[in-house]
Structure formats: structure tokens, C-alpha cells
């Protein structure tokens, strides 16, 4: 029980993460302009990874796509491809995790294979996670160095006359959504990690052999999964699997290859 | 048609308020900031402030700040400048006008008189 | 405070010439963001309220006649009349639309020689 809940909510932890992941690389404040010496601006900055956006008091806002792929900082591109690459690992992530899932049954899929794909979309969700801390940590420390360097020549005059202000950017909150939500994707992961290790079958507790009456054959029924041992018309003990429709609570109550008697 | 309509001129003495009115019609009142620009008799053009009818929003000019009190009545669409403690200096002609794009002003009403007199 | 400074402060022109309004502010207009000079221009004729002109220091709003036309970048700026007609004489005005306050030129007044 304590397996399936660590599972699912890792699922759902790291589904809500890519979904975080997926929001901040398509937002457009990465980046906005500081406010901090004109508090109230007539006209406000803003930039994504995508596009650049201007919002004037007016209430009407230009944004321009960055229409060039080799005029832009190799920073800028190396933040879109962890993004991008977060985003798709997370996506084959939550794929391989749907089918790794305890409470959903896919034909006859064993639990050691449940608990490969569970480690596997765990490990990606771990690394999507990364990618996404990555990103986001790349592009806010590109941001501090900027700020500084545009503070050091903050105004460049003209005989002192005129003045020419440059922009300054800081944090914008694509950065704080993309932070989050790279953490849960790492939370989910390593959740499914732990989750895996409750999954995978332990071979040692099921050693006991089970000794039958001579003569007793077992019979295989076709198509089916498990062996039943054959007590005449006793039933009790006959169970053939046939992959059918099946409760939770059997699937529960056949943790291993073996039948006990 | 867009137009902006004003109240009618208004004569105070020193010391007093006074409220002017600007009803919007022909567009969305939300969608646009209302600008308020005070001009004196044979002079320039000085801009008081703004509202963003949708969250009320306000923004003044230091030198009105304090003074002016702009709002907005969305279910009427209209706009209102209080200018109080009103002195000499106060008389002119004042106008609202609706910003657009580029942080223009595209439409401006006929402008209301004050007259500050004791 | 951006001060708008205009010149001349008035000027007459026949008609049909060219008339040449320059305005400048302390401190520069450009937005960086979308390379967009946030200068306006506004005609007042007698008795009348402003009426804009142009915007983002070159377009022209829709209805003005194409003699009228705007350019500059940064802080300096000029409106120019390529051919005055009669009913342009008015008095003219530059604005900072970038920054608050919103701050206007003293104005020029454009007569008829």
C-alpha cells in the first residue's frame, strides 16, 4: 500500500513539476526590467526565451519573436535546449510512468518489469528536474552578471547634459516558476525511485516449496500465467490465471511466481 | 463614435473642491486609461495624471499628488478629477483624454473652465 | 522630470513651404525593449482641445494628412510640414509619452507668413 501511494504521488508530484517546466519555458518574463529607481514606468520590459515584450501604460503590449537563431547569445540558446530537453525527458518520464503505475493493470506485465519502468521514469524525472534547475540557474546568473555590468555604466552622457538610461533586467517570475517546478520533478523522481525498491520482487521470500502427494500432476492451463495444481474437484485450491479482468485485491494477493498451498 | 463629454464650467472660490466629470461613450470604458492635462490660459499643456478604469489604478504628476484625486465609475462610464484646496493658479481650462498605443492620447474632450475667485 | 525643450518657439512659414519643428528632451526617449521612440506630437488649434498628430516619434495616427511627418531618435526630434496649408496653422506640442510624469514642450506656434 505504502509502494503505490510513494508511486502515484510521485507521479502526480512530477507531473505537476513538468507541467511547471512546461509554463516557464513558454513565458515570457524570464527576465523583466528593474523598477527599483523608477518604481512607476510609463513603459515596462519584459523578456522570455522566445520573445521580447513591451507593455506601455496605455494597457497595449508588443511582443517581437526572436526571429534569429544565430544572432542570439549562446547562453540564451543553451537555457531553451535544457528546457527543451527537460521538458521531453519529463514527457517520456510520465509515459513510462503511466504504464509503471501498480493500480493500472497492462495485460501481463509482471512487477519486475513495473519496477524497471518506475526506476527509469524516476531516473528521467530526476534529470529532467536538473535540466530545468539548470536552465533556470544559468539564465538568472546571466542576468546578475548583465544587471552589473549595465549598473557600472548605468548612465553615459553627453557633456553631463543628456542622459541615456539603460534598461536593467532582473529576475522575472518564469525563473521562480521554473526553480519550483524543477524541484517537484526531482522530488517526483526520486519518489519513484524509492517506490521502485518497494516494487521490485524479492526473491528470498518466496523459497518455500510446496510438497504435494505423489502422483498429483501439474497442469498448465494455455495461455495462462501461473501453474494450478490439480486436487481433483477441489477448487479451493486450484487458481488458473487466465489474464482476464482481475480486482485490485487480487492483484495484491499474488506477489510472486509461485502458488502457495 | 468615440467621444469624451465633460461637465459643464465651474466657478470656486479659494480653498474649496471642485469635481469634474468625463463620460466616456463609443468604446469599451475599461479597455483605456484616462489621462487629465490642465492647460492655462495661453500656455502649454501639463498632464495631472491617469486612471486605469478597470482596477482604478492611479498615477500623478508630484506636482498634483495630493491634491487631485482621479476615479472611475465603470457601470457609468465615467472619470473624475477632485482637485481640492483650490487657488488662483488652479484657474484654467482642463482636459481628460483617452491613451492608446504608443502612450498617446487619441481622443480629448471640448475641456471644462475653473475659475479660481474670490 | 524629462524636460521637453521646442524650438522655435514661433515660426512663420508661407504657404506651400516646408515648415521644420524640432523638439528635445533630456533624456532619451528610445525604449531598448522594442526600439520604439515613445515621442508624440499634438496640434492645438484656437479654442479647440490637442488633436494627435504622430506617435513612437514617426507613425502617424490614422486621419492625418501624409504632409505631416515625424523623425529623431533618442532626444532629438523634428516635425515637418512638406507643404503648409492654411489650416495647419495651430500651435504644436512634442511629449514624452516613456516615463511619468508625462511632460509636454512649451509648444510652437506655427503662423502664416
Known amino acids: 500500500m505504502a509502494v503505490t501511494a510513494c508511486q502515484g504521488l510521485g507521479f502526480v508530484v512530477s507531473l505537476i513539476g513538468i507541467a511547471g517546466i512546461i509554463a516557464a519555458t513558454c513565458m515570457d518574463q524570464w527576465s523583466t526590467q528593474d523598477l527599483y529607481n523608477n518604481p512607476v514606468t510609463a513603459v515596462f520590459n519584459y523578456q522570455g526565451l522566445w520573445r521580447s515584450c513591451v507593455r506601455e501604460s496605455s494597457g497595449f503590449t508588443e511582443c517581437r519573436g526572436y526571429f534569429t537563431l544565430l544572432g542570439l547569445p549562446a547562453m540564451l540558446q543553451a537555457v531553451r535546449a535544457l528546457m527543451i530537453v527537460g521538458i521531453v525527458l519529463g514527457a517520456i518520464g510520465l509515459l513510462v510512468s503511466i504504464f509503471a503505475l501498480k493500480c493500472i493493470r497492462i495485460g501481463s506485465m509482471e512487477d519486475s518489469a513495473k519496477a524497471n519502468m518506475t526506476l527509469t521514469s524516476g531516473i528521467m524525472f530526476i534529470v529532467s528536474g536538473l535540466c530545468a534547475i539548470a536552465g533556470v540557474s544559468v539564465f538568472a546568473n546571466m542576468l546578475v552578471t548583465n544587471f552589473w555590468m549595465s549598473t557600472a555604466n548605468m548612465y553615459t552622457g553627453m557633456g553631463g547634459m543628456v542622459q541615456t538610461v539603460q534598461t536593467r533586467y532582473t529576475f522575472g517570475a518564469a525563473l521562480f516558476v521554473g526553480w519550483v517546478a524543477g524541484g517537484l520533478t526531482l522530488i517526483g523522481g526520486v519518489m519513484m525511485c524509492i517506490a521502485c525498491r518497494g516494487l521490485a520482487p524479492e526473491e528470498t521470500n518466496y523459497k518455500a516449496v510446496s510438497y504435494h502427494a505423489s502422483g498429483h500432476s501439474v497442469a498448465y492451463k494455455p495461455g495462462g500465467f501461473k501453474a494450478s495444481t490439480g486436487f481433483g474437484s477441489n477448487t479451493k485450491n486450484k487458481k488458473i490465471y487466465d489474464g482476464g479482468a482481475r480486482t485490485e485485491d487480487e492483484v495484491q494477493s499474488y506477489p510472486s511466481k509461485h502458488d502457495y498451498v | 463614435q468615440v467621444q469624451l463629454v465633460q461637465s459643464g464650467a465651474e466657478v470656486k472660490k479659494p480653498g474649496a473642491s471642485v469635481k469634474l466629470s468625463c463620460k466616456a461613450s463609443g468604446y469599451t470604458f475599461t479597455s483605456y486609461v484616462i489621462n487629465w492635462v490642465k492647460q492655462k490660459t495661453g500656455q502649454g499643456l501639463e498632464w495631472i495624471g491617469e486612471i486605469h478604469p478597470r482596477g482604478g489604478n492611479t498615477y500623478y504628476s508630484e506636482k498634483f499628488r495630493g491634491r487631485a484625486t482621479l476615479t472611475a465609475d465603470k457601470s457609468i462610464s465615467t472619470a473624475y478629477m477632485e482637485l481640492s484646496s483650490l487657488r488662483s493658479e488652479d484657474t484654467a481650462v482642463y482636459f481628460c483624454?483617452?491613451?492608446?498605443?504608443?502612450?498617446?492620447?487619441?481622443?480629448w474632450d471640448q475641456g471644462t473652465t475653473v475659475t479660481v475667485s474670490s | 522630470d524629462i524636460v521637453m525643450t521646442q524650438s522655435p518657439s514661433s515660426l512663420a512659414v508661407s504657404l506651400g513651404e516646408m515648415a521644420t519643428i524640432n523638439c528635445k528632451s533630456s533624456q532619451s526617449l528610445l525604449n531598448s525593449g522594442n526600439q520604439r521612440n515613445y515621442l508624440t506630437w499634438y496640434q492645438q488649434k484656437p479654442g479647440q482641445p490637442p488633436k494627435l498628430l504622430i506617435y513612437?516619434?514617426?507613425t502617424r495616427e490614422s486621419g492625418v494628412p501624409d504632409r505631416f511627418s515625424g523623425s529623431g531618435s533618442g532626444t532629438d526630434f523634428t516635425l515637418t510640414i512638406s507643404s503648409l496649408q492654411a489650416e495647419d496653422v495651430a500651435v504644436y506640442y512634442c511629449?514624452?509619452?516613456?516615463?511619468?510624469?508625462?511632460?509636454f514642450g512649451q509648444g510652437t506656434k506655427l503662423e502664416r507668413k
Open positions: 513612437w516619434a514617426s
Open positions: 483624454a483617452r491613451l492608446r498605443r504608443g502612450n498617446a492620447m487619441d481622443y
Open positions: 511629449q514624452n509619452s516613456y516615463n511619468y510624469p508625462y511632460t
